[in-house]
């Protein structure tokens, strides 16, 4: 589809005569009829197969034809066609005299013809005008012509339809040959495929508009080259989507088991030393002068019970002072004025006189010590438990509670790996550098999840007078370790003073 355009430029008829030689009265009021048809070697009358057009009266005798494309499109003359331009044509241009206002062929006498020209040849589609001049005996016509494609038609013969668009079906303009030219940011045969952000990962990323980078599930970041850890992951990372690779100090499927409580929480106060002892478990070793689970309590000078033989301690600004019971003296009431006659030995101790009755010595039964057998034996003072094991007093004996990865009476043996499925009751086994660790299901505890969770007998704080409470794991009962000066299963009785 296109348009044959004919631009009339100048017509010369100096004598103002018709083709017959007869002059026009008063002058030749001239208009043109144009016929465009298929190529003929000899142009003959017949249908104007490519179209025809007539002009109004353009002038009298000789005149120049001005451009009038804005005023109704009369010059250049437009001969549209809706077929593929064949590249050849025949053109007939007739100049006629109009005696009156009616320019219809049937209203004109046949001798009103002024001149007739006919040309034929090849013509390629293009913007350039071809200039031509045809001269007869009495007239001369100067004109130019061209063939251009209609809007949205392109190519050598105006046969390629191309309509620019910028919507879901394409984003392009049209090149002169009718090929699509994608708008910036689009590609593909019909320019429907956006060009993603530069560097957007080919597999992990995609885009729905130019310069975008949207990530497929499991990927994140500007270029979709960072993975997303598993939904349940707590303290882990990934190298592929949905992984959970634990950070240092964390364990478990979702990296939610704290294997390094000391580092993560710094629970020990006042410069104490922290030791990890399993999942969310730790032990604080206090500096002198501090006590408590987290070494949060500051000891007074009297907290070490320095006064012997039932002496009472009084804190002073510059230290402490012991008030000795009758029969004792010295800085710590360590010297006795008593003899065996005064029954100074407690807890069933037997008295032996020394220095001809001037002093005495107590022989204590098992589990008791001190110059008057007033102290319960602490069998853990020698730190017998190896590998960070916790020592527990158990009446006349002691036992070691081992850290994960160790076993034996004194935690002296290193447990091997998890190959033997050592965790009971569905416990999960973890191989650690320090040995293995069992993560127990609810209701079970112990190094191998072998113990049904027992009650904490010390939870009710049954021991009096700042005594230390221990749970006897074999009987689920408590044992109180009394401070100096107190006795009884709950340390509820003060030590009786010997008779003076």
């Amino acid at each position: 589809s296109g348009v044959f355009q004919l631009q009339l430029q100048e017509f010369v008829n100096e004598r103002g005569v018709l083709a017959s030689g007869r002059p026009c009265e008063p002058g030749c009021r001239t208009f043109f009829r144009v016929c465009l048809k298929h190529f003929q070697a000899v142009v003959s009358p017949g249908p104007c197969t490519f179209g025809s057009v007539s002009t109004p009266v353009l002038g009298t005798n000789s005149f120049a034809v001005r451009d009038d494309s804005s005023g109704g499109g009369r010059n250049p003359l437009q001969l549209p066609f809706n077929f593929t331009w064949p590249g050849t044509f025949s053109l007939i241009i007739e100049a006629w005299h109009a005696p009156g206002d009616d320019l219809r062929p049937e209203a004109l006498p046949p001798d009103a013809l002024i001149s007739k020209i006919a040309i034929q040849g090849s013509l390629a589609v293009g913007q350039n005008w071809l200039l031509d001049e045809q001269t007869s005996t009495l007239t001369r016509l100067r004109y130019s012509y061209r063939v251009i494609c209609s809007d949205n038609y392109y190519g050598d013969n105006c046969s390629r339809l191309c309509k620019k668009r910028n919507d879901h079906f394409g984003h392009y303009v049209c090149q002169p040959d009718g090929n699509l030219s994608c708008l910036p940011g689009w590609t593909g045969e019909y320019c429907q495929q956006p060009i993603c952000l530069s560097g957007c990962h080919e597999q992990n990323g995609y885009c729905s508009k130019p310069a975008e980078c949207l990530c497929r599930p499991g990927w994140q970041g500007r270029l979709c080259n960072e993975c997303i850890p598993h939904n349940g992951c707590r303290h882990g990372t990934c190298s592929t989507p949905w992984q959970c690779t634990c950070d240092e100090g964390w364990g478990g499927l979702f990296c939610d088991q704290d294997l390094n409580y000391c580092t993560h929480h710094s629970p020990c106060k006042n410069g104490a030393t922290c030791s990890n002892s399993g999942q969310r478990s730790y032990t604080c070793t206090c500096r002198p002068g501090y006590t408590g689970v987290d070494c949060e309590l500051e000891l007074s000078e009297c907290d070490s019970n320095p006064c012997r033989n039932g002496g009472s301690c009084k804190d002073q600004e510059d230290g402490y002072h012991c008030l000795c019971p009758p029969g004792y003296y010295g800085l710590h009431c360590e010297h006795s004025t008593l003899s065996c006659a005064d029954s100074p030995c407690f807890n069933g101790g037997s008295c032996r006189e020394r220095n001809q009755g001037a002093s005495y010595a107590c022989e204590c039964p098992p589990n008791f010590t001190g110059s008057n057998c007033e102290k319960k034996v602490d069998r853990c003072t020698s730190n017998p438990c190896a590998n960070g094991g916790q020592c527990l007093n158990r009446g006349p004996s002691r036992m070691c509670r081992c850290r994960p990865g160790f076993t034996g009476t004194y935690c002296e043996r290193h447990v091997s790996d998890c190959a033997r499925n050592p965790c009971a009751h569905g416990g999960t086994c973890h191989d650690l550098e320090s040995g293995l660790m069992c993560t127990c299901p609810a209701g079970f505890s112990g190094r191998r999840c072998e113990v049904r969770t027992s009650i904490d007998a010390c939870a009710s704080s049954p021991c009096f007078n700042r005594a230390t409470c221990y749970t006897d794991l074999s009987t689920d009962t408590f044992v109180c370790n009394c401070p100096y000066g107190f006795v009884g299963s709950r340390c509820e009785f003060p030590v009786g003073l010997p008779p003076s």
Epitope: S208, C213, P217, Q220, G221, R222, C233, H235, G236, T237
Partner: antibody, heavy 118, light 107 residues
Framework: EVQLVESGGGLVQPGGSLRLSCAAS????????MAWVRQAPGKGLEWVAT????????NYRDSVKGRFTISRDNAKSSLYLQMNSLRAEDTAVYYC???????????WGQGTLVTVSS | DIQMTQSPSSLSASVGDRVTITCRAS??????LAWYQQKPGKAPKLLIY???NLADGVPSRFSGSGSGTDFTLTISSLQPEDFATYYC?????????FGQGTKLEIK
């Protein structure tokens, strides 16, 4: 235990601004992408914005683009939503969540109410 | 944007009942679908992800199935604490979108 605690909601006039904050704990914040999801009173859930773990790429729903800005401070384990040019239709409970636009929202905060009204 | 349509919008059931909620996507979302539970005045809680994977701590009476465009959440034996509103969500296509919700009420 994973905890996400939002703050900063309140009553604001149309055209006004508000900054929401979300304090995260119980997980290694810097490893995970984060999001804001909102719920208008009596309505359903609507994704608002996400940010990748490395803080290099935010995404927004079309209706808040150019008005809202999501950001994070990995050192403080905190997520933020700066809301400008607020409209009545932005009225909602805003939830801080751990997740991305292409993954489930695994953990949620308790929400903070934003009311835009004159 | 992908439209997510849940049915029914509301549902009455009794403790011990087996309950099914469906979710339909306007186009293929493969298995990239999650289910959430929300109780009044509370935040949503992830129940199921990737169509059929139970989130941590979610009881086994909850299960999910489906693929492509049609998905189902099933509660095998309803418990008193299960009465809530349930939402599906797709995360296959940008932007992520939620269903309108299904309110599960006690009969």
């Amino acid at each position: 235990e994973v905890q996400l605690v939002e703050s900063g909601g309140g009553l604001v006039q149309p055209g006004g601004s508000l900054r929401l904050s979300c304090a995260a704990s119980g997980f290694t914040f810097r490893h995970f992408p984060m999001a804001w999801v909102r719920q208008a009173p009596g309505k359903g859930l609507e994704w608002v914005a996400t940010i990748s773990s490395s803080d290099d790429w935010p995404n927004y729903r079309d209706s808040v683009k150019g008005r809202f800005t999501i950001s994070r401070d990995n050192a403080k384990s905190s997520l933020y939503l700066q809301m400008n040019s607020l409209r009545a239709e932005d009225t909602a409970v805003y939830y801080c969540s751990r997740g991305y636009y292409n993954s489930p929202f695994a953990y949620w905060g308790q929400g903070t109410l934003v009311t835009v009204s004159s | 944007d992908i439209q997510m349509t849940q049915s029914p919008s509301s549902l009455s059931a009794s403790v011990g009942d087996r309950v099914t909620i469906t979710c339909r996507a306007s186009e293929d979302i493969y298995s990239n679908l999650a289910w959430y539970q929300q109780k009044p005045g509370k935040a949503p809680k992830l129940l199921i992800y990737d169509t059929n994977n139970l989130a941590d701590g979610v009881p086994s009476r909850f299960s999910g199935s489906g693929s492509g465009t049609d998905f189902t959440l099933t509660i095998s034996s309803l418990q008193p604490e299960d009465f809530a509103t349930y939402y599906c969500q797709q995360y296959n296509n940008y932007p992520p979108t939620f269903g309108q919700g299904t309110k599960l009420e006690i009969k």
